[in-house]
């Protein structure tokens, strides 16, 4: 009976996500058969989050909207380890919007999910950010410095990275 009600709960939770994600890839967390963590297929997973590389070229605002339609946000990068994971799936000749912007052009950078902006955990290329007109952040590859962040005009279309919390069922 317990297993039955657990299965029913799982199914209803899966139905919730079905509108965004017709298929999920789930893995067993730990030793308990009852704890599963899932990411939409073909998203990738790292720690407690799922990531999707959107190859469509859109403005920052449209990219964020695109992520939110899928129940996600443009990516918020919290650690070097997280960035190192993300870049494994990126193409060196492309740039990708992050969930980081400076809406008023005052050098007051903010993350889309309101995570406090911490200057000590940023990975700007050297000399970046450097322009009051460039209010959105991308991650891109520079031969001299590998992967890092750069500020650019928000309306210039780029690829993007979406991030959402893992789905636990």
């Amino acid at each position: 009976n317990f297993m039955y009600s657990k299965t029913v709960k799982r199914l209803s939770k899966l139905r919730e996500y079905q509108q965004y994600h017709p298929s999920l890839t789930c893995v067993m967390e730990g030793k308990d058969i009852e704890d599963w963590s899932c990411c939409p297929t073909p998203w990738t997973s790292f720690q407690s989050s799922c990531y999707f590389i959107s190859t469509g070229m859109q403005s920052w605002t449209k990219s964020q909207k695109n992520c939110s339609v899928m129940g996600a946000d443009l990516v918020v990068i919290n650690t070097r380890e997280e960035q190192d994971f993300i870049i494994q799936n990126l193409k060196r000749n492309s740039s990708y919007f992050l969930g980081l912007s400076d809406p008023g052009g005052r050098r007051h950078w903010q993350w889309v999910d309101q995570t406090p902006y911490n200057e000590n955990v940023t990975f700007w290329h050297s000399g970046e950010p450097n322009n009051l007109d460039e209010r959105c952040a991308i991650i891109n590859f520079r031969s001299s410095e590998e992967w890092g962040w750069n500020d650019i005009h928000c309306h210039v279309p780029q690829k993007s990275i979406c991030k959402m919390k893992k789905i636990y069922i």
Epitope: N131, D133, H153, H155
Partner: antibody, heavy 118, light 107 residues
Framework: QVQLQQSGAELVRPGVSVKISCKGS????????MHWVKQSHAKSLEWIGV????????NYNQKFKGKATMTVDKSSTTAYMELARLTSEDSAIYYC???????????WGQGTSVTVSS | DIQMTQSTSSLSASLGDRVTITCQAS??????LNWYQQKPDGTVKLLIY???RLHTGVPSRFSGSGSGTDYSLTISNLDQEDIATYYC?????????FGGGTKLEIK
């Protein structure tokens, strides 16, 4: 080539307002914000503020809030600055300057002289 | 606001001389230091940005250096057309601020 053409010299009475203009050409106007700078004998160069030619929002030096109002007209690729309630302290040369990379003003207008005198 | 100090307000030098103009910020400005030249007719031009990068079309006799709070502009071979007033400006923090200027004259 990049050019910023400012309006001509103004001689105005105390208490009135004046609006000076800066027409940008030779580049994509909305890709670069416009700064305004005051030069008076007493104070060397002072940054008044900057207006985004794309978004239309602006950042002012606290000292010039209430004194200066910056606007843009995208269709004519012109930036404007209005100075209100003029006093002799406002007599100066005013420059517009284009925003550039590395927090710099990369091209400047020729300056507009404003003289406040009764 | 960040204060920018150009301790020398005027400087006299001979043609061909090497001239150095200094600028000090009241706090670290992370190399966001720019130099402008204002000719006697009022024309203002950007010379150097981000401490040491030469703006388009600026002769290579101009160079910049510095870090933290202390910066300098050097003209290596003074030319007649360099007669002007030179201003430093910090772009690290709004409001942007300028030094008081250094007027360069020929001996």
């Amino acid at each position: 080539q990049v050019q910023l053409q400012q309006s001509g010299a103004e001689l105005v009475r105390p208490g009135v307002s004046v609006k000076i203009s800066c027409k940008g050409s030779g580049y994509t106007f909305t890709d670069y914000s416009m700064h305004w700078v005051k030069q008076s004998h007493a104070k060397s160069l002072e940054w008044i503020g900057v207006i985004s030619t794309y978004y239309g929002d602006s950042n002012y030096n606290q000292k010039f809030k209430g004194k200066a109002t910056m606007t843009v007209d995208k269709s004519s690729t012109t930036a404007y600055m209005e100075l209100a309630r003029l006093t002799s302290e406002d007599s100066a040369i005013y420059y517009c300057a284009r925003n550039g990379n590395f927090y710099v003003m990369d091209y400047w207008g020729q300056g507009t002289s404003v003289t406040v005198s009764s | 606001d960040i204060q920018m100090t150009q301790s020398t307000s005027s400087l006299s030098a001979s043609l061909g001389d090497r001239v150095t103009i200094t600028c000090q910020a009241s706090q670290d400005i992370s190399n966001y230091l720019n130099w402008y030249q204002q000719k006697p007719d009022g024309t203002v031009k950007l010379l150097i940005y981000y401490t040491s990068r030469l703006h388009t079309g600026v002769p290579s006799r101009f160079s910049g250096s510095g870090s933290g709070t202390d910066y300098s502009l050097t003209i290596s071979n003074l030319d007649q057309e360099d007669i002007a007033t030179y201003y430093c400006q910090q772009g690290n923090t709004l409001p942007w601020t300028f030094g008081g200027g250094t007027k360069l004259e020929i001996k």
